[in-house]
Structures are given as C-alpha cells and as structure tokens.
Amino acid sequence: GSERTCCPVNWVEHERSCYWFSRSGKAWADADNYCRLEDAHLVVVTSWEEQKFVQHHIGPVNTWMGLHDQNGPWKWVDGTDYETGFKNWRPEQPDDWYGHGLGGGEDCAHFTDDGRWNDDVCQRPYRWVCETELDKASQEPPLL
C-alpha cells in the first residue's frame, strides 16, 4: 500500500489526521464497523486541542467516539493507552450504569452536548466521527 498524503473527499484534515463527521446515527458497533470499512477508526481523542476541534465540528449533539469498556477496562479502538491518555469525562462519569432495562451496562463513550464525555448504552443511534492518520499506509494500491 501507499502512504496517504491527503484526505479523502468530504473528510476534514487536522494535525495530520483526517476526520469524517456523520449526519445520521448508528449504534456504537455499527459506527465502529462503518469506520473500519473506510480504512479508519472511531475518533481517538489524545489532546485538549483535538477535543476542541472535534467539538467544534459536531456541535451540541451526542456523538460516539472510539472508546469503550465492553470487555472490562476502558480501551481506545486504536490501542492508545487509556490510563495515561487525555480524558474529558463529565463529573461522576463514567458510571457504567447497570440500572437501565438492558442486561449490560453503559459500555460506550460519547461526546455530550457540552463536549464532555459520558458512557451510555451502546445501542443508542448517536452520530459518530471517523478518524484516519495521514501518515498511515493506505490499503489502496498505488496509482501506476
């Protein structure tokens, strides 16, 4: 594969990453799958600067990110270390609430209307953000 040097059409470039902002909603797993099919991943927020960038583009709308604890500990989908990394939870979150009508807890993280993070039921059809790194090798064959 070749190294991607510019963002695909309809993606927004920022700090050597490309971002795509959905305008419809999907459950977290479907959003995760959508990004993977685009050779990307759900957005991984690594800094306050990136948080502000994403927040600016999504507005005051609940939006999935690439952070979940479906298998126990909180994990970023691209392997970024959660414990030492950037966090922006709402006060008293994440609470992994088990009181709702589901068998499981709130295992997926999203941006809330004020940009801070909350964990919620992964089935809610929230909007989502895909991210891919410009320096990453593309799966597409090089143009001859």
């Epitope: 419809s24 609470d95 609430w97 009181g99 709702h100 009508g101 089935q123 059809p125």
Partner: antibody, heavy 129, light 107 residues
Framework: QVQLVQSGAEVKKPGASVKVSCKAS????????INWVRQATGQGLEWMGW????????GYAQKFQGRVTMTWNTSIRTAYMELSSLRSEDTAVYYC??????????????????????WGQGTTVTVSS | DIQMTQSPSSLSASVGDRVTITCRAS??????LGWYQQKPGKAPKRLIY???SLQSGVPSRFSGSGSGTEFTLTISSLQPEDFATYYC?????????FGPGTKVEIK
C-alpha cells in the same frame, strides 16, 4: 403497577411557555428514558425528544430544537417538558412515554430494539389568543 | 430524518376480514420498527416490536413482517375492538419518526 401520570390541561396565549409534568411510579425512575410525543387534534403522532435522568442526556427533534427543554427531578420521580414561544399549531395532546432498550433472545449477534412500553394519559395544551 | 409513509391512510372493513397495512421507510431501518394502536381519546398501545415480535397480551391475530424499508401489519380476522388508528414507529435513528397513521373503520 407501572404508571405515568401527567399534569392537567393548560390554556396558553401565543408567545407564552408551557411546562407539562409526568410523574412516574412503580419502577426505578432513573433506569429508563422518558420520551415526549404530541398529537394535534385529528392528526398523527409526532416524536419530540427523549431524556434520561441517569446520564443527564437529552435529544430533541430538530423541529423543536431551541424551543423545547426536557428536565427532571429525581427526588419526586417527575419528568418535565417545557415548550416556549407557543403558537396555535402547538395546540395538541402531549404524551410522555417510558423508553428503554431490550433485546431479542436467540439472535446472534444480539438484536436490540427500543421499547416505549408505558404511556401517560396525555395533557391537552391549547394555544389561543 | 427518516420519513415513514403508510398505506392506505384509511380503510373500511367488516368483522372477520383480513386487513393489511403497509409502512415504508425512506431508507433502510433493519427491523427497528414498532406498530401501535390508538383509540380515540386514549394513549397509543404497542402491538408489535422489532418488526415482527408480538407484544405479550396482544391477540395472535395481529402479526408483523418485513425488514429494511417495507413493513406490514396484518390483522388476520378483524374484531370489533380492532377498529382504531394504527401507526408505525422507526427507532433506527434520531429523531424517531411515526408513520402518518391508518384509520380502520367499520364498513
């Protein structure tokens, strides 16, 4: 048993605000969403939005964005829907409905659906000058 | 937003008739659809969830089918208490949207 009891009928002037309440009983209030749905006389059902008293999350239909606010008071197990800048077209019956995700057994991967299983009796709001 | 359409908008039928109501979504919604019955002056009551699962306590003459964009509610043998308005509701994406309703009247 599980019940949602709504406040009484309201008559408002155009430009005013109305706040409808929905008191829950028979279940853990914070374990479920509350949805608000309205129905103008002789018309169909229109979903306005939802709120969750545990997460603090709300979601409003674009049509009502900026005019509707959904709040709650956990201590008295009551949800509220406030609609501002009222106009004659807002004359309708307003319903609250309990909502939650559940799943079908025997499906792999698990298939989830959203259930609005219990509804309030409705509150009539009339907007007239 | 996902638009829901229903047909017919109203129908006249006799007790014992088989009645079919169709609901179409403007885009694929998997099985994320419920059917509700509403009688005058009353709150809606859910009959079918996940497109084809019967709500407990609802008579077996009601059934639902379909997935993707086309869904059907069938009443196999219409009873006097079934005269009402029927609505479909999609919960695949926010905002949730109802169909415009189908009024089932006595012929």
């Amino acid at each position: 048993q599980v019940q949602l009891v709504q406040s009484g009928a309201e008559v408002k002037k155009p430009g005013a605000s109305v706040k409808v309440s929905c008191k829950a009983s028979g279940y853990t209030f914070t374990s479920y969403d509350i949805n608000w749905v309205r129905q103008a006389t002789g018309q169909g059902l229109e979903w306005m939005g939802w709120m969750n008293p545990n997460s603090g999350n709300t979601g409003y239909a674009q049509k009502f964005q900026g005019r509707v606010t959904m709040t709650w008071n956990t201590s008295i197990r009551t949800a509220y829907m406030e609609l501002s800048s009222l106009r004659s077209e807002d004359t309708a019956v307003y319903y609250c409905a309990r909502g939650f995700y559940d799943f079908l057994t025997g499906y792999s991967p698990t298939y989830y659906y959203y259930d609005m299983d219990v509804w309030g009796q409705g509150t009539t709001v009339t907007v007239s000058s | 937003d996902i638009q829901m359409t229903q047909s017919p908008s109203s129908l006249s039928a006799s007790v014992g008739d088989r009645v079919t109501i169709t609901c179409r979504a403007s885009q694929g919604i998997r099985n994320d659809l419920g059917w509700y019955q509403q009688k005058p002056g009353k709150a809606p009551k859910r009959l079918i969830y996940a497109a084809s699962s019967l709500q407990s306590g609802v008579p077996s003459r009601f059934s639902g089918s379909g997935s993707g964009t086309e869904f059907t509610l069938t009443i196999s043998s219409l009873q006097p208490e079934d005269f009402a308005t029927y609505y479909c509701l999609q919960h695949n994406d926010y905002p949730f949207t109802f169909g415009p309703g189908t009024k089932v009247e006595i012929k």
